[in-house]
Amino acid sequence: QRLPRMQEDSPLGGGSSGEDDPLGEEDLPSEEDSPREEDPPGEEDLPGEEDLPGEEDLPEVKPKSEEEGSLKLEDLPTVEAPGDPQEPQNNAHRDKEGDDQSHWRYGGDPPWPRVSPACAGRFQSPVDIRPQLAAFCPALRPLELLGFQLPPLPELRLRNNGHSVQLTLPPGLEMALGPGREYRALQLHLHWGAAGRPGSEHTVEGHRFPAEIHVVHLSTAFARVDEALGRPGGLAVLAAFLEEGPEENSAYEQLLSRLEEIAEEGSETQVPGLDISALLPSDFSRYFQYEGSLTTPPCAQGVIWTVFNQTVMLSAKQLHTLSDTLWGPGDSRLQLNFRATQPLNGRVIEASFPAGVDSSPRAAEPVQLNSCLAAGD
């Protein structure tokens, strides 16, 4: 599906990816002032020895000398079940039994900036993507993924951490945003809404999608997540929107079929290795990129976000399974686990393709107001 306010409902079906350029180029309505934009806090937790929460529970990466680059995931924080998205939700919550940054939820007190000042930063995520205003940067080359096709063994840890479902990835998954911009994948997790209620974190022209996948990476320039936090380019997240299509997505089914086993908050299971790249769109050449932050406390900035233009299609049943199986803290369903979009504050979103050119015959003259910052040069 095209990301931008698609005018067609013609899913590709089958494979992991959706149609061609979802985020593309149509006339999407903006909803800056809508209730959807009320800060439903982000949710991701990073680890490190200092209990740093972030894009879900990020693993601590030890220097190769210590353990041949193995990733150790410390379950630092847990985001509590999403609150009512009608209420402002840029809030963090300190659980009785946790320390300062261990337990979070969507909605509630205290406000996130009180828990982590970075959450009030100027360059936060997620954001609303406006293709017409994106700067076309020919220097943004197709993403390169290496080692993402995992064998069944060793198995991987799939965990309900109370604010998402997270798959911890083994060493060896390499990703390059461009020459000299190399990363290692740490984990992936999802954000979703509820039936009839969209739950992606990023939006396109104000349009929120049913769900969103995040694959979190650590720059090879750093040995540990806590060293990379807040450093420009220290972390990179690949993000893709999930939409409803007519057929079951076999790649996602390998994870979704196991969710019942981890329905309870804090529970985990082991799943056979799979092709992680099959969870992403097939077109690695068309994407949007900007510098933002983790979408949950500590909301560390300097994170490079790459949002695919193509979407991934899941069946209605699969989306329902995703949003209706897991439970968060207390007796609340784990749903609507997304943070509201944050202001760009002067940031320019770059596009690897001319996203400002609307293919629709209804479009007026193409608008390309922003120029490329030559990322990657």
Partner: antibody
């Protein structure tokens, strides 16, 4: 395609069982809605059933009187209507329910008339 | 629960643009869908998920959802577009469909 059947004339307090036969898609992959429309009135949600049939939902106006069920082996949806009232008179539609909340495929409807 | 409010009728000259509104609290938190229903026929989904057009629906149909109002826009309205139009969404109660009262175009 969805095809409803079982409608007809019934007296107040009586019962009726509606069926909805599905074809052309994997029935067990979709939740299904029953929606009704009284003569000259708008659309009104009646009931919904999940893929497997394990979860069911009802509008307050029919709760306790109507029962929704499905037989995935027969690709058929049912609505058992008991203690019928005059205000239940309507055309009853079954509709395939998408995750997003929309219904992209509807049956042609079957008329239920409750009158003495 | 959420209530959807539509104007009872909207009139427009052929070839002009028709706009049908649907209002409800916190509407952008939900996907809004639009159905067209002609006399004696079953409803047909014309706009899904706020603004998506199912295959077979003419390009003149479009939708938006922001603030507390969703809007169905029919540009270059044709005589065949004369029908009742219903907006729909989920209620706050899980798996509960809600319909607007309908608008006769």
């Amino acid at each position: 395609e969805l095809v409803e059947s079982g409608g007809g004339l019934v007296q107040p307090g009586g019962s009726l069982r509606l069926s909805c036969a599905a074809s052309g898609f994997t029935f067990s992959d979709y939740s299904i809605n029953w929606v009704r429309q009284a003569p000259g009135k708008g659309l009104e949600y009646v009931s919904n059933i999940s893929y497997s049939g394990s979860s069911t939902y009802y509008a307050d106006s029919v709760k306790g009187r109507f029962t929704i069920s499905r037989d995935n082996s027969k690709n058929t949806l049912y609505l058992q209507m008991n203690s019928l009232r005059a205000e239940d008179t309507a055309v009853y539609y079954c509709a395939r329910f998408k995750y997003s909340g929309g219904s992209d495929s509807w049956g042609q409807g079957t008329l239920v008339t409750v009158s003495s | 629960d959420i209530e959807l409010t539509q104007p009872p009728s909207v009139s427009v000259a052929p070839g002009q643009t028709a706009r049908i509104s649907c209002s409800g609290d916190n509407l952008p938190d939900f996907y809004v869908h639009w159905y067209q229903q002609k006399p004696g026929q079953a409803p047909v989904l014309v706009i899904s998920e706020d603004n998506k057009r199912p295959s077979g629906i003419p390009e003149r149909f479009s939708g938006s959802n922001s603030g507390n109002t969703a809007t169905l826009t029919i540009s270059g309205t044709q005589a065949e577009d004369e029908a009742d139009y219903y907006c729909s969404t989920y209620g706050y109660t899980y798996s509960y469909s809600v319909f607007g009262g309908g608008t006769k175009l």
